[in-house]
């Protein structure tokens, strides 16, 4: 009688013997930042280590009766999600608590400043093997916690945090809403978005991906072998700390960056039911649920992407929006989108050294979205070849020209208010695997990048009817890099990437009165690490 | 996930240096910025975050956290430094009045000024 | 090695109260806590509570709460139940025994038999 | 409150056979579940603690299995000595200690 929970993240391999993965994370620390906890429980005795941190405000009322098993219950749950002997996740790691949070359940800003600052201090002191941060707390937007929290991540820290129990944007919230974080949403045992009284899971682009969040049993503090069941975007983002943990254990040497496309890569796709969250945040919010990797195989082998969403640029006419990768990615194609279709495309620029996607809006426009394809590779060398508009009835076109070199993803801008109005090209012609093709007043960017043993391919789903939506997807053993739209007429709405999936979304055709000859194609660039193929095969 | 123009209220005082006449006062026009945390039941006025700017040395911390207490005196304001940041940011956590914030924000090094606010249990 | 004498059964008038004594030996006293668990003729295991001899503190089974009490004396190595308002239903055979909380209870003595009749 | 429903109440065995003996908690305990013997005119006596690990001096034929809701003791041949009744256990906030109701092994 397994938990749910466990079942739910445990690959169909593990599950023969019930749940009985290897006792991971043993190399890992995991720092938690919380309230008190039972460190006598059973769950967790002999591998929690309470240290002397404690920043906590007084709590609130005059007639507050302090109660120890009230104050350490939040703290202990979450403890024995993480590594319980019975009901943890990973059953290796060890634990170190610090109370931030007084008995309500009540921290600030500064004393989780000063908490992260502790833990910062002491791997300077005393360096050890991988950190996971657990931050099972959120409050508003906060710039100064952001960037603390962006500093650990860089000194080598896995940050995880809940997404925030608020049914709401997750980026209004902090630590969720630093890039750096891995942020974790809460589904439940239908795989829905968990739902806590009148509100709810968070949502949105500043998630990174889901975990079981309600009715998860873990340690009470009732007693020292009671068990309880919670729920909450805490104990979801426990379970992600916990599956970090024996993913590090199995590969010390991963970066945050590593550590998060796998995280996305080994999750359930398209399992939770999206009509819970609010329309306009449904293409925002990733549709994964976290699960452990099928063993503690090495995947250095695969090329893993993720996509990533800017914040909205708002409706002025000149309005941008920015998608980034994270530190140790490359973006190898930029997309955009826009709900009213009226956008000006979007283009690679290169800003503080690194590359970044921007997106454009039109004049009447609502705003749009800029939409990155981050990827993991080796030794990659990336150039943006540009073409300005064509003028001519062939449309725009541009490949990569330099030896080596393959096409990753397909950008388009244009200065015309309206591309509508200017009759679209025709599709690429075939052969030509390394160009891109856009509307004749639009300049067209293509995204070329080397890197060892780097092979692309050029996958198109043209659909002579008017749709909603085209997709296309890549095949097993190739990754998603690019995904655009063939023609880029003022009925797409613009292109995103979902998993593998290159998707392509116009406006409602019943009401723009289009024909037929607006056909619309998804284009995917599709590719593989040959040299990490290899790579691979010499490990094993 | 959140750029750091996110959405949260901030404001900007564009403050230039005056009556104090330090050696080391910010450039002509330099701007340091005050955020708040937009949820207002959940906003700690009175305690606030000076964050000083990435390039800063160490001991610029402690040295800037004087000079805001010294100042402070001379106006007859009652400060706390409660905590020096060393390891993550730099900066100081300190205990005093909204009043002093303008001050605040014209000391050389100082890149923004948060207002503390709670975080909950999830 | 370890042992718990159990003494003070009886037989006892309904209303009446008893005072039952459980004396350990062969490790050291401090380290472990107690319960108290009786069993009434052909039935199943009841427990009354327990004491914490380092600290003193006491739990007990809502049941007996303001009927039972637990004390030790730890200079005798002795645990001591005192039962109140004794009725018929409460004639059973008393057991101590030696536990860590939220472990087993690993070591029980021999049981003394409580009577309750007029 | 757990509540540790055993099963069956009575099981009629040789000497011989083997004997399986189910213990049902209320709600998830994960493996913090102890077995107990008892022969009449004894005291308890610690058989298995934390669901399967055997105490000092019980010999191997006694085995202890399950976790979170469902637990098995199961005698592998049983011994003229083994005719008792067997109780579990766990830990509970109130009250702390929970028995089962017991499962009497007769001889047949």
């Known amino acids: 009688s397994i938990p749910w929970n466990l079942e739910r993240i445990t690959p169909a391999r593990y599950r023969a013997d019930e749940y009985q993965p290897p006792k991971g994370g043993s190399l890992v620390e995991v720092y938690l930042l919380d309230t008190s906890i039972q460190s006598d429980h059973r769950e967790i005795e002999g591998r929690v280590m309470v240290t002397d941190f404690e920043s906590v405000p007084e709590e609130d009322g005059t007639r507050f009766h302090r109660q120890a098993s009230k104050c350490d219950s939040h703290g202990t749950h979450l403890a024995g999600v993480v590594s319980g002997r019975d009901a943890g996740v990973a059953k290796g790691a060890g634990l170190r608590s610090l109370r931030v949070l007084n008995c309500q359940g009540k921290g600030t800003v500064s004393g989780t400043l000063i908490g992260l600052e502790f833990i910062r201090k002491s791997q300077l002191v005393q360096p050890v093997g991988p950190l996971v941060v657990l931050l099972p707390l959120a409050g508003g937007y906060s710039r100064v916690f952001n960037a603390a929290c962006q500093r650990l991540a860089r000194a080598g820290v896995v940050l995880v945090t809940a997404a925030g129990n608020f049914r709401d944007d997750a980026c209004l919230y902090s630590p969720a809403s630093a890039p750096e974080v891995i942020t974790v949403g809460a589904t439940n045992a239908q795989d829905q978005p968990v739902t806590l009284g009148t509100l709810g899971t968070n949502f949105g682009r500043c998630v990174d991906l889901f975990a079981p969040g309600e009715d998860i049993i873990g340690a009470s503090s009732d007693c020292s072998t009671c068990f309880v069941s919670r729920s909450g975007t805490s104990q979801a983002a426990a379970h992600v700390a916990g599956i970090a943990a024996m993913m590090l254990s199995a590969e010390p040497e991963l970066t945050l960056a590593e550590l998060r496309q796998r995280l996305i890569h080994f999750s359930a796709k398209d399992v939770i039911n999206e009509a819970w969250f609010p329309e306009d945040q449904r293409v925002l919010t990733p549709n994964l649920v976290a699960a452990l990797p099928p063993s503690t195989h090495r995947a250095g082998w695969q090329l893993f992407c993720r996509t990533v969403w800017s914040a909205h640029s708002g409706p002025t006419r000149m309005a941008t929006a920015v998608a980034r990768c994270a530190q140790d990615e490359e973006l190898l194609s930029c997309s955009s989108f826009s709900r009213s279709g009226k956008r000006r495309g979007e283009r690679i620029e290169a800003q503080g050294g690194k590359r970044v996607c921007r997106a454009h809006n039109a004049f009447g426009g609502e705003g749009v979205y800029a939409i990155a394809r981050c990827c993991l590779l080796p030794q990659v060398n990336c150039s943006v070849h540009t073409a300005p508009p064509a003028g001519a009835s062939m449309g725009t076109r541009v490949h990569c020209h330099q030896q080596g070199h393959v096409l990753t993803g397909c950008s388009s801008h244009w200065e015309v208010e309206d591309l509508g109005t200017h009759k679209p090209p025709v599709l690429r012609p075939r052969g030509q695997p390394n160009q891109c093709v856009g509307h004749r007043e639009a300049s067209i960017h293509a995204s070329c990048c080397h890197a060892p043993g780097l092979e692309c391919k050029v996958k198109e789903h043209g659909i002579p009817a008017p749709q909603e939506q085209v997709i296309v997807a890549c095949e097993d053993g190739w990754t998603l890099t690019g995904c655009s739209p063939l023609p880029g007429t003022s009925h797409v709405l613009g292109a995103y990437a979902v998993d593998n999936t290159c998707v392509v979304r116009s406006r409602d055709v019943s009401t723009t009165g289009s024909t037929s000859k607006e056909a619309v194609a998804a284009v995917a660039i599709c590719c593989r690490s040959r040299h990490l193929v290899q790579a691979s095969q010499e490990l094993q | 996930q959140e750029d750091e123009d996110g959405d949260y209220e901030e404001l900007v005082l564009a403050l230039r240096s005056e009556e104090d006449g330090l050696a080391d006062a910010p450039e002509h026009g330099a701007t340091a910025t005050f955020h708040r945390c937009a949820k207002d039941p959940w906003r700690l006025p009175g305690t606030y975050v000076v964050v000083l700017k990435e390039e800063t040395h160490r001991s610029q911390s402690e040295r800037t956290a004087r000079r805001l207490q010294a100042q402070a005196a001379r106006r007859g304001y009652l400060t706390k430094i409660l905590h020096v940041f060393h390891h993550l940011l730099p900066g100081f956590l300190v205990k005093m009045s909204g009043d002093l914030l303008e001050l605040a924000l014209k000391l050389p090094h100082v890149d923004y000024i948060e207002e503390d606010s709670s975080v909950f249990a999830q | 090695q370890v042992q718990l004498l159990e003494s003070g059964g009886g037989l006892v008038q309904p209303g009446g109260s008893l005072r039952l004594s459980c004396k350990a030996s062969?490790?050291?006293?401090?380290?472990?806590?107690f319960s108290w668990v009786r069993q009434a003729p052909g039935k199943g295991l009841e427990w009354i509570g327990y004491?914490?001899?380092?600290?003193?503190?006491?739990k007990y089974n809502q049941k007996f709460q303001g009927k039972a009490t637990i004390s030790r004396d730890n200079s005798k190595n002795t645990l001591y139940l005192q039962m109140n308002s004794l009725r018929a239903e409460d004639t059973a055979v008393y057991y101590c025994?030696?536990?860590?909380?939220?472990?087993?209870?690993?070591?029980w003595g021999q049981g003394t038999l409580v009577t309750v009749s007029s | 409150e757990i509540v540790l429903t055993q099963s069956p109440a009575t099981l009629s065995l040789s000497p011989g056979e083997r004997a399986t003996i189910t213990c049902r908690a209320s709600?998830?305990?994960?493996?913090?579940l102890n077995w107990y013997q008892q022969k009449p005119g004894q005291a308890p006596r610690l058989l298995i603690y934390?669901?399967?690990n055997r105490a000092t001096g019980i010999p191997a034929r006694f085995s202890g299995s399950g976790s979170g809701t469902d637990f098995t003791l199961t005698i592998s041949s049983l011994e003229p000595e083994d005719f008792a009744v067997y109780y579990c256990?766990?830990?509970?906030?109130?009250?702390?200690?929970?028995f089962g109701g017991g499962t009497k092994v007769e001889i047949k």
């Open positions: 004491i914490d001899p380092g600290s003193g503190g006491t």
């Open positions: 256990q766990v830990w509970d906030s109130s009250p702390p200690v929970v």
């Open positions: 025994a030696r536990q860590r909380v939220g472990y087993s209870l690993d070591y």
């Open positions: 709600q998830y305990v994960g493996s913090y």
């Open positions: 934390d669901a399967s």
């Open positions: 062969g490790y050291t006293f401090s380290s472990y806590s």
